[in-house]
Amino acid sequence: TQHGIRLPLRSGLGGAPLGLRLPRETDEEPEEPGRRGSFVEMVDNLRGKSGQGYYVEMTVGSPPQTLNILVDTGSSNFAVGAAPHPFLHRYYQRQLSSTYRDLRKGVYVPYTQGKWEGELGTDLVSIPHGPNVTVRANIAAITESDKFFINGSNWEGILGLAYAEIARPDDSLEPFFDSLVKQTHVPNLFSLQLCGAGFPLNQSEVLASVGGSMIIGGIDHSLYTGSLWYTPIRREWYYEVIIVRVEINGQDLKMDCKEYNYDKSIVDSGTTNLRLPKKVFEAAVKSIKAASSTEKFPDGFWLGEQLVCWQAGTTPWNIFPVISLYLMGEVTNQSFRITILPQQYLRPVEDVATSQDDCYKFAISQSSTGTVMGAVIMEGFYVVFDRARKRIGFAVSACHVHDEFRTAAVEGPFVTLDMEDCGYNIPQTDESTLMTGRA
């Protein structure tokens, strides 16, 4: 997970769903028992802070040591602070755990900006507000880091929920979720509802508020409205998907769809922004600027650097367009679209705004490693990571921030031909370099 460029995200209380819940599709596939319904004990188990990550409480070792762990679908290591650090309130003390086993192996993870390194071991792990199970999992005990932990973020480790292929030091290190599924009866699926606040939260508000839900092993009906639409996981490394079309306020960007997925498109809860390949970013910003041309914003705003402020309560949401991403559907030549609002891609910034002002950063940015559907996307939706069926589901989140005129949407089906051609095939020789620094 890349801090600096790939900063973890923002969280907090979301607005209530707009209008009544839409009826379910009648032809929805039946699910195996236990995978749907109510998961009361897991609802609201995430907390977080603006731009700094959504975290879940976990316990490690015997007796259990409680730590807050960043939920990251863009990496595959379970790694926790295991030595004193100025930004950590607490850390994993292996010497106090009777069940810790040393693997006598080191791990080093560099990012484009920053790094962490540590020692591999295994220990007993559980999630208090998760399934009632304990698993023996691989743990990277972080002994040294640079620009990884974030001051005031309130998390002490990271839970990489992606696949073994991108685990460090190599794919032989079983990720936590694989261990969980192998050792228990928990179904091979989890779902995330990340709730953006729509306004900045101070530290005490964050600790008192809901950041969202991670439902392990199932889908909770109360967390979404309308229907779930699924897109195939193209390859099990990151949660890679295929985008087949992009629209700004209903206007097609009209690019070769390969550009949208160059060199990949992933769903990543550990990234704040919607990150787009250079050409796509430039086209999207040009289109967003044109749609909001009654007002002109500084160049630095579009670079995600300068903040634009409005008098409290007067943010002109209506001048900013909605953004739709069309994703490959499960049926041949069928796609569906997910639509986000400016309430998702303009990120409220704390510390700068006064009670007189609401200040925002533009949360769409340029990427050199493909499209990253970070919090900007995920905060609009309930996202189901259905690993068992190699697919990712999207439905409108019951906690997404919106206004009285527009709401986020998941709609389909749409006819789209030759969607397989939209995927980019990464040359084998490039992969090792791609994975060391996700810019």
């Epitope: 009654t294 002109k296 914003f297 500084p298 160049d299 630095g300 650097e305 300068q306 903040l307 402020c309």
Partner: antibody, heavy 120, light 108 residues
Framework: QLQLQESGPGLVKPSETLSLTCTVS??????????WGWIRQPPGKGLEWIGM???????WYNPSLKSRVTISVDTSKNQFSLKLSSVTAADTAVYYC????????????WGRGTLVTVSS | EIVLTQSPATLSLSPGERATLSCRAS??????LAWYQQKPGQAPRLLIY???KRATGIPARFSGSGSGTDFTLTISSLEPEDFAVYYC??????????FGGGTKVEIK
């Protein structure tokens, strides 16, 4: 080259409305690259941003003055104007009009300024 | 709200000397900071923008540095026409409404 020139009465009575106009010459006010703003400076004091306008008519105001300020644009005359209502002696200042350029962030070109005194 | 504090309030120097003016922001403003020069009876003039970029027509003896919260305007060798008041302005938060209180550079 582009120049800005403020004009308007130099003396305004308390409780009345201060009205100033800035005429842009040597270039078009309708350029999509710029905002046009007003800044004031009380005698012997620092600079205070009043507000600014885009050629489309979109405006931004200093919250501390917002209830009393109106900035408008007349693209046909290549002018933009400032109205400040219910003035008091505290509004006595040199009023400058300026162009906001360099990526729409900095005041890169200023008028000479005009002193407005509020007195009965 | 971001507050800009300039120091010193007054700097007394002789022509040919080096002038170092400071501007401190209450929070990080990245590199979104400008410096203006104002001579008596004249309008301010943009000297430096983006913390370190010289505006058109500004002599090379003027230089800006810094990022985050601490910024410096340096005049390498004071010319008689450089004695004036200097203001910093942050535009990290937009619209660009925050100026510092000013530093007066006077002849010693």
């Amino acid at each position: 080259q582009l120049q800005l020139q403020e004009s308007g009465p130099g003396l305004v009575k308390p409780s009345e409305t201060l009205s100033l106009t800035c005429t842009v010459s040597g270039g078009s006010i309708s350029s999509s690259s710029y905002y046009w703003g007003w800044i004031r400076q009380p005698p012997g004091k620092g600079l205070e941003w009043i507000g600014m306008i885009y050629y489309s008519g979109s405006t931004w105001y200093n919250p501390s003055l917002k209830s009393r300020v109106t900035i408008s644009v007349d693209t046909s005359k290549n002018q933009f104007s400032l109205k400040l209502s219910s003035v008091t002696a505290a509004d006595t200042a040199v009023y400058y009009c300026a162009r906001v350029g360099h990526g729409v962030s900095y005041f890169d070109l200023w008028g000479r300024g005009t002193l407005v005194t509020v007195s009965s | 709200e971001i507050v800009l504090t300039q120091s010193p309030a007054t700097l007394s120097l002789s022509p040919g000397e080096r002038a170092t003016l400071s501007c401190r922001a209450s929070q990080s403003v990245s590199s979104y900071l400008a410096w203006y020069q104002q001579k008596p009876g004249q309008a301010p003039r943009l000297l430096i923008y983006g913390a370190s970029k010289r505006a058109t027509g500004i002599p090379a003896r003027f230089s800006g540095s810094g990022s985050g919260t601490d910024f410096t305007l340096t005049i390498s060798s004071l010319e008689p026409e450089d004695f004036a008041v200097y203001y910093c302005q942050q535009v990290y938060t937009w619209p660009p409404r925050t100026f510092g209180g000013g530093t007066k550079v006077e002849i010693k």
